[in-house]
């Protein structure tokens, strides 16, 4: 049994460490900045493109609270959802409803996560005295991937390339909070 994947209810499967049932994300601050910035150079002709780097897809930003059992993150996390049809970069609209969708005939190009980042989140829990934290793996960027009929769904779960490792530094650790403080913050958060 390897690292599990959990669905964040927003089109993409995000690899996680264990399996943690997630409720639908709370799109309280749904910043859907539709960007088509993963493309390469424009193709010679929209229907003759062979190079995956010439395709682009949209990165939707949204925020959600991380939950783990009865616990919830003190702050929401912002992550990307890789969305939409992959098409030649120069034809891809910058927003839904603008321009014309280009549908490739032939190989299936999928908009999938390219890189991930892990973020440590402080959890607010009812009761419990130990400081609780969880690391969530979030999509950092998207890419178009050419899928043939031989590719299966597991192709969509690859971790992509690792981001550069940050320098190891020391941070003060979170203090344990009292059950009452935890509960109050939880209730306020909702």
């Amino acid at each position: 049994q390897g690292w599990q994947a959990f669905k964040n209810d927003a089109t993409e499967i995000i690899p996680e460490l264990g399996e943690y049932p997630e409720p639908p994300p709370e799109l309280e601050n749904n910043k859907t900045m539709n960007r088509a910035e993963n493309g390469g150079r424009p193709p010679h002709h929209p229907f003759e493109t062979k190079d995956v780097s010439e395709y682009s897809c949209r990165e939707l930003h949204f925020t959600r609270y991380v939950t783990d059992g009865p616990c919830r993150s003190a702050k929401p996390v912002t992550e990307l959802v890789c969305s939409g049809q992959c098409g030649p970069a120069r034809l891809l609209p910058n927003a839904i409803g603008r321009g014309k969708w280009w549908r490739p005939s032939g190989p299936d190009f999928r908009c999938i996560p390219d890189r991930y980042r892990a973020q440590r989140v402080q959890l607010l829990c009812p009761g419990g005295e130990a400081p609780r934290a969880r690391k969530v793996r979030l999509v950092a960027s998207c890419k178009c991937k050419r899928l043939t009929r031989f590719h299966n769904q597991s192709e969509l779960k690859d971790f992509g390339t690792e981001a550069a490792r940050p320098q190891k530094g020391r941070k003060p650790r979170p203090r344990a909070r009292s059950a009452k403080a935890n509960q109050a913050e939880l209730e306020n958060a909702y």
């Epitope: 690292w3 264990g18 440590r120 009761g127 130990a130 609780r132 190891k168 530094g169």
Partner: antibody
């Protein structure tokens, strides 16, 4: 597939130190919390502490405070646990474990036997 | 420290039996409880966390219940590969502590 591979068995004299390594593969170590748990012969499990390899944050059980040091090398995805001032009661199998939270242990290494004997 | 008391410390059962192991905490630990399975000479394996959430890949015959101070691990129909020692662990208060273990042996 997540794997944690620990260093080999050690025999130490009382008062000495031991450093056990734990190589993590299948996931970057910085994306996890690393835990150390030990088990004396024929006994139960005892949590020693956790560390966050990304920022060097640690939390040790008070019983081991001052004697234990947990570190990581994120370039090689390896965690280390050093226990000093060894005594015979420290004879145990030492396990590294990893998880995405500070309070449970999702995956475990195979264990490293440390024997403290004069 | 929170004391975790498991009972029984050992039990003998046959394949197909329903087995129940209990774990009692010395103070309220809400649902911050995990169950692990350990076979001789091997490392423990996480089975259940949050008292009742089964880890992916763990057979459905394993179930956990309880909150507060009293918790139960149930194996609905014991299989040959289930003969092992089971430990509970509280994740409520530092230091995290384990129960003494319950050894499930073949009758």
């Amino acid at each position: 597939q997540v794997q944690l591979v620990q260093s080999g068995a050690e025999v130490k004299k009382p008062g000495a130190s031991v450093k056990v390594s734990c190589k993590v593969s299948g996931f970057p170590i910085k994306d996890t919390f690393q835990h150390w748990v030990r088990q004396a012969p024929g006994k139960g499990l005892e949590w020693m502490g956790w560390s966050d390899p990304e920022i060097g944050d640690t939390e040790y059980a008070s019983k081991f405070q001052g004697r234990v040091t947990m570190t990581e090398d994120t370039s090689t995805d390896t965690a280390y646990m050093e226990l000093s001032s060894l005594r015979s009661e420290d004879t145990a199998v030492y396990y590294c474990a990893t998880g995405d939270t500070t309070y449970k242990f999702d995956f475990w290494g195979q264990g490293t036997t440390v024997t403290v004997s004069s | 420290d929170i004391q975790m008391t498991q009972s029984p410390s050992s039990l003998s059962a046959s394949v197909g039996d329903r087995v129940t192991i209990t774990c009692r905490a010395s103070q309220d630990i809400h649902t911050y409880l995990a169950w692990y399975q350990q076979k001789p000479g091997k490392a423990p394996k996480l089975l259940i966390y949050w008292a009742s959430t089964r880890l992916s890949g763990v057979p459905s015959r394993f179930s956990g219940s309880g909150s507060g101070t009293d918790f139960t691990l149930t194996i609905s129909s014991l299989q040959p590969e289930d003969f092992a020692t089971y430990y509970c662990q509280q994740g409520d208060t530092l230091p995290y502590t384990f129960g003494g273990g319950t050894k499930v042996e073949i009758k």
